[in-house]
């Protein structure tokens, strides 16, 4: 039961995390104009990975895409790549983990297969989360560098736009969304890997051994047993029925096409 909960929670946490990574990647507010030095400005600039926006004081916003690939800073391209890799890995991880969920039965898929899929998706989520955290951190570092350079009366380039000493850019909302989302995806991935250990069937066949204790005798009859991994609530050895790989709480007479629990 605990294995199912851990796996399910890992899936949900990763799903939220990947949704957050997608949201952060699409958001325009990766860097926002620092208004500390110029509170009377009527023009507010903010920039994303794909376009830059200008908001007039009275509310009208105009955004312009970066219609160049070669003209953009290499760091920005690297951040884009990291975020996209994170999304792709996360999406594949989600797809794999859906089929790996213990509460969903597809045909006669064995626990070992589910365990492998759970581990695969877990690793994918971990790498996806790391990609997002790395991407956001690289961008944040770029901002910090440019912030202090512009403070020191230097001219810097950000997001393919000319930035004079007048305007400094600071962390936008997308960075925080990205960090949190990356962290959630990472946590979800770790949970999936933990769940995998609880799913893995470590089968051991014991020979018939007769023990004689004082007072009474207990005979252990031969039969296949499923060894407990010590994870989750599956602490008792459970007898395998019909030589299959299913435990008592998963009895299924005939696997049907659409057999979901």
């Amino acid at each position: 039961m605990a294995v199912t909960a851990c796996q399910g929670l890992g899936f949900v946490v990763s799903l939220i995390g990947i949704a957050g990574i997608i949201a952060a990647t699409c958001m325009d507010q990766w860097s926002t104009q620092d208004l500390y030095n110029n509170p009377v400005t009527a023009v507010f600039n903010y920039q994303g990975l794909w376009r830059s926006c200008v908001r007039e004081s009275s509310g009208f916003t105009e955004c312009r895409g970066y219609f160049t690939l070669l003209g953009l800073p290499a760091m920005l391209q690297a951040v884009r790549a990291l975020m996209i890799v994170g999304i792709v890995l996360g999406a594949i991880g989600l797809l794999v983990s859906i089929f790996a969920l213990k509460c969903i039965r597809i045909g006669s898929m064995e626990d070992s297969a589910k365990a492998n899929m759970t581990l695969t998706s877990g690793i994918m989520f971990i790498v996806s989360g790391l990609c997002a955290i790395a991407g956001v951190s690289v961008f944040a570092n770029m901002l910090v560098t440019n912030f202090w350079m512009s403070t020191a009366n230097m001219y810097t380039g950000m997001g393919g736009m000319v930035q004079t000493v007048q305007t400094r850019y600071t962390f936008g909302a997308a960075l925080f969304v990205g960090w949190v989302a990356g962290g959630l995806t990472l946590i979800g991935g770790v949970m999936m890997c933990i769940a995998c250990r609880g799913l893995a069937p470590e089968e051991t066949n014991y020979k018939a051994v007769s023990y004689h204790a004082s007072g009474h005798s207990v005979a252990y009859k031969p039969g296949g047993f499923k060894a407990s991994t010590g994870f989750g609530s599956n602490t008792k050895n459970k007898k395998i029925y019909d030589g299959g790989a299913r435990t008592e709480d998963e009895v299924q007479s005939y696997p049907s096409k659409h057999d979901y629990v």
Epitope: V40, A42, V43, S58, G59, F60
Partner: antibody, heavy 115, light 112 residues
């Protein structure tokens, strides 16, 4: 097409209150802020401030803080300028103009304050 | 506050000729996003102002291409080629980079 239709001319006495309306049509009202501009007889243009038609947030130029009030009736797509405790020097034509760039203007409302 | 200065109160011109109207700002209107927040308006006699040029050099919709805007961060020029009778009125420059938005005093275009 985009239009800003302002209310008719007003003749008021000092100390009274006037409320001018500016009804927008032809565009999404809440997407663009509304500016108010004053033009005294024979003088140039003076920016009074703006109202954000989405949030209702207002910003006033220093000379127009206190007696001047911008408001909205979003359902009627209308912005209002209210001037309280009118003074002789408030005699002017008041224009509403769309967004910071003031790309569209109302026809103006003439307010005459005389005792 | 940013002060907008239009030195010439009026400019006489013969129809068909070209004319330039100048405007200066007390502070650069060039923003870090590459835009210069300088606008030109024409107020014909008895009418409300009309936007001619936005962000220093962009022609507003419906405005004839006889009008053009240019300038640097602080010095700006509105040029009208082949002046027509309908171009008479007062030309105002305005900045909306910072609060409060400020207008120049205006330059009146008169036909000789």
């Amino acid at each position: 097409q985009i239009q800003l239709a302002q209310s008719g001319p007003e003749l008021k006495k000092p100390g009274e209150t006037v409320k001018i309306s500016c009804k927008a049509s032809g565009y999404s009202f809440t997407n663009y802020g509304m500016n108010w501009v004053k033009q005294a007889p024979g003088k140039g243009l003076k920016w009074m401030g703006w109202i954000n038609t989405y949030s209702g947030e207002t910003k006033y130029a220093d000379d127009f803080k206190g007696r001047f009030d911008f408001s909205l009736e979003t359902s009627a797509r209308t912005a209002y300028l209210q001037i309280k405790n009118l003074k002789i020097e408030d005699t002017a034509t008041y224009f509403c103009a769309r967004r910071d760039a003031m790309d569209y203007w109302g026809q103006g409302t003439s307010v005459t304050v005389s005792s | 506050d940013i002060v907008m200065t239009q030195a010439a109160p009026s400019v006489p011109v013969t129809p068909g000729e070209s004319v330039s109207i100048s405007c200066r700002s007390s502070k650069s209107l060039l923003n870090s996003n590459g835009n210069t927040y300088l606008y030109w308006f024409l107020q014909r006699p008895g009418q409300s102002p009309q936007l001619l040029i936005y962000r220093m050099s962009n022609l507003a919709s419906g405005v004839p291409d006889r009008f053009s805007g240019s300038g640097s961060g602080t010095a700006f020029t509105l040029r009208i080629s082949r002046v027509e009778a309908e171009d008479v009125g007062v030309y105002y420059c305005m900045q909306h980079l910072e609060f409060p938005f400020t207008f120049g005093s205006g330059t009146k275009l008169e036909i000789k």
